[in-house]
Protein backbone atom coordinates (compact mmCIF):
# COMPACT_ATOMS: atom_id res chain seq x y z
CA UNK A 1 0.00 0.00 0.00
CA UNK A 2 1.29 3.53 -0.68
CA UNK A 3 2.76 5.25 2.35
CA UNK A 4 0.75 8.30 3.50
CA UNK A 5 2.42 11.61 2.61
CA UNK A 6 5.05 12.67 5.12
CA UNK A 7 5.99 9.13 6.22
CA UNK A 8 9.17 7.36 5.29
CA UNK A 9 8.69 5.61 1.95
CA UNK A 10 12.14 4.25 1.21
CA UNK A 11 10.93 0.62 1.48
CA UNK A 12 8.01 1.08 -0.87
CA UNK A 13 8.73 -0.31 -4.34
CA UNK A 14 6.22 1.78 -6.35
CA UNK A 15 5.86 5.48 -5.52
CA UNK A 16 2.33 6.82 -4.93
CA UNK A 17 0.92 7.81 -8.33
CA UNK A 18 -1.78 10.31 -9.06
CA UNK A 19 -4.75 8.73 -10.83
CA UNK A 20 -4.68 9.32 -14.58
CA UNK A 21 -6.67 12.24 -15.93
CA UNK A 22 -9.32 11.47 -18.54
CA UNK A 23 -7.01 12.79 -21.30
CA UNK A 24 -4.09 10.68 -20.09
CA UNK A 25 -6.32 7.60 -19.94
CA UNK A 26 -7.49 8.18 -23.53
CA UNK A 27 -3.90 8.76 -24.70
CA UNK A 28 -2.73 5.57 -23.01
CA UNK A 29 -5.65 3.58 -24.43
CA UNK A 30 -4.91 4.68 -27.99
CA UNK A 31 -1.24 3.82 -27.60
CA UNK A 32 -2.21 0.39 -26.26
CA UNK A 33 -4.41 -0.23 -29.31
CA UNK A 34 -1.64 0.97 -31.64
CA UNK A 35 0.74 -1.56 -30.03
CA UNK A 36 -1.84 -4.28 -30.71
CA UNK A 37 -2.16 -3.19 -34.33
CA UNK A 38 1.63 -3.33 -34.72
CA UNK A 39 1.64 -6.93 -33.52
CA UNK A 40 -1.15 -7.85 -35.95
CA UNK A 41 0.59 -6.07 -38.82
CA UNK A 42 3.75 -8.05 -38.05
CA UNK A 43 1.88 -11.34 -38.48
CA UNK A 44 0.18 -10.10 -41.66
CA UNK A 45 3.46 -8.94 -43.19
CA UNK A 46 5.27 -12.15 -42.27
CA UNK A 47 2.52 -14.29 -43.76
CA UNK A 48 2.13 -12.52 -47.11
CA UNK A 49 3.84 -9.86 -49.20
CA UNK A 50 0.91 -7.46 -48.82
CA UNK A 51 2.98 -4.89 -46.98
CA UNK A 52 5.12 -4.30 -50.07
CA UNK A 53 2.30 -4.71 -52.58
CA UNK A 54 1.54 -1.93 -55.02
CA UNK A 55 -1.90 -3.34 -55.86
CA UNK A 56 -3.59 -1.81 -52.82
CA UNK A 57 -5.83 0.43 -54.90
CA UNK A 58 -7.57 -2.65 -56.30
CA UNK A 59 -8.84 -3.72 -52.89
CA UNK A 60 -9.28 -0.24 -51.47
CA UNK A 61 -12.15 0.39 -53.88
CA UNK A 62 -14.13 -2.31 -52.05
CA UNK A 63 -13.65 -0.66 -48.68
CA UNK A 64 -15.12 2.47 -47.21
CA UNK A 65 -12.72 2.85 -44.32
CA UNK A 66 -13.04 5.96 -42.14
CA UNK A 67 -10.52 8.68 -42.93
CA UNK A 68 -9.84 12.11 -41.49
CA UNK A 69 -10.61 15.00 -43.82
CA UNK A 70 -10.10 18.77 -43.52
CA UNK A 71 -13.80 19.31 -42.78
CA UNK A 72 -13.64 17.03 -39.72
CA UNK A 73 -11.86 19.71 -37.71
CA UNK A 74 -9.10 17.41 -36.47
CA UNK A 75 -6.18 19.02 -38.33
CA UNK A 76 -4.26 22.02 -37.02
CA UNK A 77 -5.74 24.28 -39.66
CA UNK A 78 -9.44 24.65 -38.95
CA UNK A 79 -9.25 22.70 -35.68
CA UNK A 80 -12.64 22.33 -33.98
CA UNK A 81 -12.71 20.30 -30.79
CA UNK A 82 -16.36 19.17 -30.81
CA UNK A 83 -16.56 18.48 -34.57
CA UNK A 84 -13.33 16.50 -34.30
CA UNK A 85 -14.50 14.50 -31.29
CA UNK A 86 -17.71 13.57 -33.13
CA UNK A 87 -15.62 12.44 -36.13
CA UNK A 88 -13.30 10.33 -33.95
CA UNK A 89 -16.18 8.55 -32.19
CA UNK A 90 -18.14 8.08 -35.43
CA UNK A 91 -15.03 6.73 -37.16
CA UNK A 92 -14.28 4.27 -34.37
CA UNK A 93 -17.88 3.02 -34.46
CA UNK A 94 -17.55 2.57 -38.24
CA UNK A 95 -14.31 0.63 -37.78
CA UNK A 96 -16.06 -1.89 -35.50
CA UNK A 97 -17.40 -4.01 -38.34
CA UNK A 98 -13.91 -4.15 -39.87
CA UNK A 99 -12.48 -5.20 -36.50
CA UNK A 100 -15.14 -7.93 -36.42
CA UNK A 101 -13.87 -9.07 -39.83
CA UNK A 102 -10.32 -9.30 -38.45
CA UNK A 103 -11.37 -11.73 -35.71
CA UNK A 104 -10.91 -14.86 -37.80
CA UNK A 105 -7.98 -13.62 -39.82
CA UNK A 106 -5.14 -14.42 -37.41
CA UNK A 107 -3.63 -17.69 -36.27
CA UNK A 108 -0.95 -16.86 -33.72
CA UNK A 109 -2.36 -13.43 -32.81
CA UNK A 110 -5.99 -14.39 -32.29
CA UNK A 111 -6.05 -13.02 -28.73
CA UNK A 112 -4.37 -9.82 -29.88
CA UNK A 113 -7.11 -9.26 -32.48
CA UNK A 114 -9.75 -9.70 -29.77
CA UNK A 115 -7.84 -7.32 -27.48
CA UNK A 116 -7.78 -4.62 -30.18
CA UNK A 117 -11.53 -5.01 -30.67
CA UNK A 118 -12.35 -4.86 -26.94
CA UNK A 119 -9.91 -2.01 -26.26
CA UNK A 120 -11.55 0.02 -29.03
CA UNK A 121 -14.90 -0.36 -27.27
CA UNK A 122 -13.33 0.95 -24.06
CA UNK A 123 -11.83 3.88 -25.98
CA UNK A 124 -15.23 4.76 -27.45
CA UNK A 125 -16.70 4.85 -23.95
CA UNK A 126 -13.89 7.11 -22.69
CA UNK A 127 -14.43 9.49 -25.63
CA UNK A 128 -18.21 9.57 -25.20
CA UNK A 129 -17.71 10.94 -21.69
CA UNK A 130 -15.71 13.78 -23.22
CA UNK A 131 -18.22 14.63 -25.99
CA UNK A 132 -20.92 17.25 -25.46
CA UNK A 133 -23.10 16.44 -28.46
CA UNK A 134 -23.80 12.72 -28.79
CA UNK A 135 -26.84 13.51 -30.96
CA UNK A 136 -24.47 14.42 -33.78
CA UNK A 137 -23.07 10.89 -33.87
CA UNK A 138 -24.63 8.47 -36.35
CA UNK A 139 -24.16 4.83 -35.42
CA UNK A 140 -23.68 2.27 -38.19
CA UNK A 141 -26.78 0.47 -39.44
CA UNK A 142 -26.49 -3.24 -38.50
CA UNK A 143 -28.14 -4.37 -41.74
CA UNK A 144 -25.56 -2.47 -43.82
CA UNK A 145 -22.76 -3.83 -41.61
CA UNK A 146 -23.99 -7.39 -42.09
CA UNK A 147 -24.00 -7.18 -45.87
CA UNK A 148 -20.54 -5.54 -45.82
CA UNK A 149 -19.15 -8.32 -43.63
CA UNK A 150 -20.68 -11.00 -45.87
CA UNK A 151 -19.15 -9.32 -48.92
CA UNK A 152 -15.69 -9.11 -47.33
CA UNK A 153 -15.78 -12.74 -46.21
CA UNK A 154 -16.76 -13.90 -49.70
CA UNK A 155 -13.62 -12.43 -51.30
CA UNK A 156 -10.84 -14.67 -52.61
CA UNK A 157 -7.81 -15.35 -50.40
CA UNK A 158 -5.61 -12.67 -51.96
CA UNK A 159 -8.27 -9.99 -51.51
CA UNK A 160 -8.94 -11.10 -47.93
CA UNK A 161 -5.23 -10.77 -47.14
CA UNK A 162 -5.16 -7.36 -48.79
CA UNK A 163 -8.31 -6.28 -46.93
CA UNK A 164 -6.75 -7.31 -43.61
CA UNK A 165 -3.62 -5.30 -44.42
CA UNK A 166 -5.64 -2.23 -45.48
CA UNK A 167 -7.88 -2.31 -42.39
CA UNK A 168 -4.88 -2.45 -40.08
CA UNK A 169 -3.08 0.31 -41.95
CA UNK A 170 -6.13 2.58 -42.08
CA UNK A 171 -7.01 1.96 -38.45
CA UNK A 172 -3.45 2.80 -37.44
CA UNK A 173 -3.54 6.05 -39.45
CA UNK A 174 -6.94 6.98 -38.04
CA UNK A 175 -5.78 6.39 -34.45
CA UNK A 176 -2.55 8.34 -35.00
CA UNK A 177 -4.53 11.31 -36.36
CA UNK A 178 -6.94 11.00 -33.44
CA UNK A 179 -4.07 10.94 -30.96
CA UNK A 180 -2.57 14.13 -32.41
CA UNK A 181 -5.95 15.87 -32.35
CA UNK A 182 -6.85 14.75 -28.83
CA UNK A 183 -3.54 16.09 -27.52
CA UNK A 184 -4.69 19.55 -28.63
CA UNK A 185 -7.94 19.30 -26.65
Amino acid sequence: APVPPGEDSKDVAAPHRQPLTSSERIDKQIRYILDGISALRKETCNKSNMCESSKEALAENNLNLPKMAEKDGCFQSGFNEETCLVKIITGLLEFEVYLEYLQNRFESSEEQARAVQMSTKVLIQFLQKKAKNLDAITTPDPTTNASLLTKLQAQNQWLQDMTTHLILRSFKEFLQSSLRALRQM
Epitope: L93, K121, Q125, L134, P142, N145
Partner: nanobody, 118 residues
Protein backbone atom coordinates in the same frame (compact mmCIF):
# COMPACT_ATOMS: atom_id res chain seq x y z
CA UNK B 1 -30.61 -16.79 -29.57
CA UNK B 2 -32.42 -14.06 -27.66
CA UNK B 3 -36.21 -13.92 -27.48
CA UNK B 4 -37.65 -10.40 -27.66
CA UNK B 5 -41.13 -9.52 -26.42
CA UNK B 6 -42.73 -6.11 -27.01
CA UNK B 7 -45.48 -4.72 -24.80
CA UNK B 8 -47.16 -1.40 -24.03
CA UNK B 9 -49.11 -0.90 -27.25
CA UNK B 10 -52.72 0.18 -27.31
CA UNK B 11 -55.22 2.81 -28.41
CA UNK B 12 -54.39 6.44 -27.67
CA UNK B 13 -55.71 9.85 -28.69
CA UNK B 14 -53.65 12.12 -30.95
CA UNK B 15 -51.30 14.20 -28.83
CA UNK B 16 -51.07 11.45 -26.21
CA UNK B 17 -48.16 9.29 -25.09
CA UNK B 18 -47.27 5.62 -24.85
CA UNK B 19 -44.22 3.74 -23.67
CA UNK B 20 -43.34 0.50 -25.41
CA UNK B 21 -41.06 -2.08 -23.80
CA UNK B 22 -38.83 -4.64 -25.45
CA UNK B 23 -37.85 -7.32 -22.95
CA UNK B 24 -35.17 -9.87 -23.74
CA UNK B 25 -34.85 -13.38 -22.45
CA UNK B 26 -32.61 -16.27 -23.41
CA UNK B 27 -29.03 -15.44 -22.57
CA UNK B 28 -27.19 -12.39 -21.25
CA UNK B 29 -28.53 -9.49 -23.26
CA UNK B 30 -25.69 -7.22 -24.34
CA UNK B 31 -26.42 -6.62 -28.01
CA UNK B 32 -24.45 -4.46 -30.39
CA UNK B 33 -27.62 -2.53 -31.30
CA UNK B 34 -31.34 -2.63 -30.52
CA UNK B 35 -33.62 -1.08 -33.10
CA UNK B 36 -37.30 -0.15 -33.18
CA UNK B 37 -39.24 -0.54 -36.41
CA UNK B 38 -42.88 -0.09 -37.35
CA UNK B 39 -45.20 -1.30 -40.05
CA UNK B 40 -48.16 0.99 -40.78
CA UNK B 41 -51.26 -0.71 -42.23
CA UNK B 42 -50.73 -1.60 -45.89
CA UNK B 43 -47.16 -0.29 -45.92
CA UNK B 44 -43.66 -1.69 -45.62
CA UNK B 45 -41.79 -1.91 -42.34
CA UNK B 46 -39.80 1.25 -41.60
CA UNK B 47 -37.00 2.24 -39.22
CA UNK B 48 -37.97 4.24 -36.11
CA UNK B 49 -34.77 4.44 -34.11
CA UNK B 50 -31.91 2.51 -32.57
CA UNK B 51 -29.62 2.50 -29.55
CA UNK B 52 -26.15 1.00 -29.79
CA UNK B 53 -24.10 -0.85 -27.16
CA UNK B 54 -22.56 2.39 -25.89
CA UNK B 55 -25.90 4.19 -25.54
CA UNK B 56 -25.78 6.38 -28.67
CA UNK B 57 -29.24 6.84 -30.19
CA UNK B 58 -30.37 7.64 -33.71
CA UNK B 59 -33.92 8.35 -34.92
CA UNK B 60 -35.87 8.55 -38.15
CA UNK B 61 -36.64 12.18 -39.10
CA UNK B 62 -40.37 11.55 -38.73
CA UNK B 63 -40.07 10.83 -34.98
CA UNK B 64 -37.13 13.05 -33.97
CA UNK B 65 -37.98 15.18 -30.93
CA UNK B 66 -41.09 13.11 -30.14
CA UNK B 67 -39.75 9.60 -29.55
CA UNK B 68 -36.97 8.60 -27.16
CA UNK B 69 -35.21 5.25 -26.81
CA UNK B 70 -33.73 4.24 -23.47
CA UNK B 71 -32.57 1.04 -21.89
CA UNK B 72 -32.38 -0.64 -18.51
CA UNK B 73 -29.47 -3.07 -18.53
CA UNK B 74 -30.44 -4.53 -15.17
CA UNK B 75 -33.81 -5.62 -16.53
CA UNK B 76 -32.63 -6.52 -20.06
CA UNK B 77 -35.22 -4.07 -21.41
CA UNK B 78 -35.20 -1.34 -24.05
CA UNK B 79 -37.97 1.28 -24.10
CA UNK B 80 -39.53 3.47 -26.75
CA UNK B 81 -41.18 6.53 -25.21
CA UNK B 82 -43.61 8.02 -27.74
CA UNK B 83 -44.93 11.53 -27.09
CA UNK B 84 -47.13 13.88 -29.13
CA UNK B 85 -48.47 10.90 -31.07
CA UNK B 86 -50.09 11.47 -34.47
CA UNK B 87 -52.59 9.31 -36.42
CA UNK B 88 -49.75 8.53 -38.89
CA UNK B 89 -47.85 6.82 -36.04
CA UNK B 90 -50.47 4.04 -36.14
CA UNK B 91 -48.59 0.79 -36.84
CA UNK B 92 -47.38 -2.50 -35.47
CA UNK B 93 -44.15 -1.71 -33.60
CA UNK B 94 -41.30 -4.23 -33.53
CA UNK B 95 -38.01 -4.32 -31.68
CA UNK B 96 -34.99 -6.12 -33.07
CA UNK B 97 -31.50 -6.85 -31.78
CA UNK B 98 -28.18 -7.17 -33.58
CA UNK B 99 -25.94 -9.39 -31.46
CA UNK B 100 -22.66 -8.25 -33.09
CA UNK B 101 -21.42 -5.46 -35.32
CA UNK B 102 -21.65 -7.63 -38.41
CA UNK B 103 -24.65 -9.81 -37.61
CA UNK B 104 -27.50 -7.62 -38.79
CA UNK B 105 -30.74 -7.74 -36.80
CA UNK B 106 -30.74 -11.41 -35.91
CA UNK B 107 -33.53 -11.41 -33.29
CA UNK B 108 -37.01 -9.94 -33.73
CA UNK B 109 -40.02 -9.54 -31.48
CA UNK B 110 -43.56 -10.43 -32.52
CA UNK B 111 -44.75 -6.79 -32.51
CA UNK B 112 -47.24 -4.69 -30.57
CA UNK B 113 -50.09 -2.71 -32.10
CA UNK B 114 -50.25 1.07 -31.59
CA UNK B 115 -53.37 2.89 -32.79
CA UNK B 116 -53.59 6.68 -32.64
CA UNK B 117 -57.10 8.07 -33.13
CA UNK B 118 -57.84 11.61 -34.20
Amino acid sequence: QVQLVESGGGLVQAGGSLRLSCAASGRTFSPYTVGWFRQPPGKVREFVGRINWSGIRNYADSVKGRFTISRDNNNNTVYLQMNRLKPEDTAVYYCAAASQSGSGYDSWGQGTQVTVSS
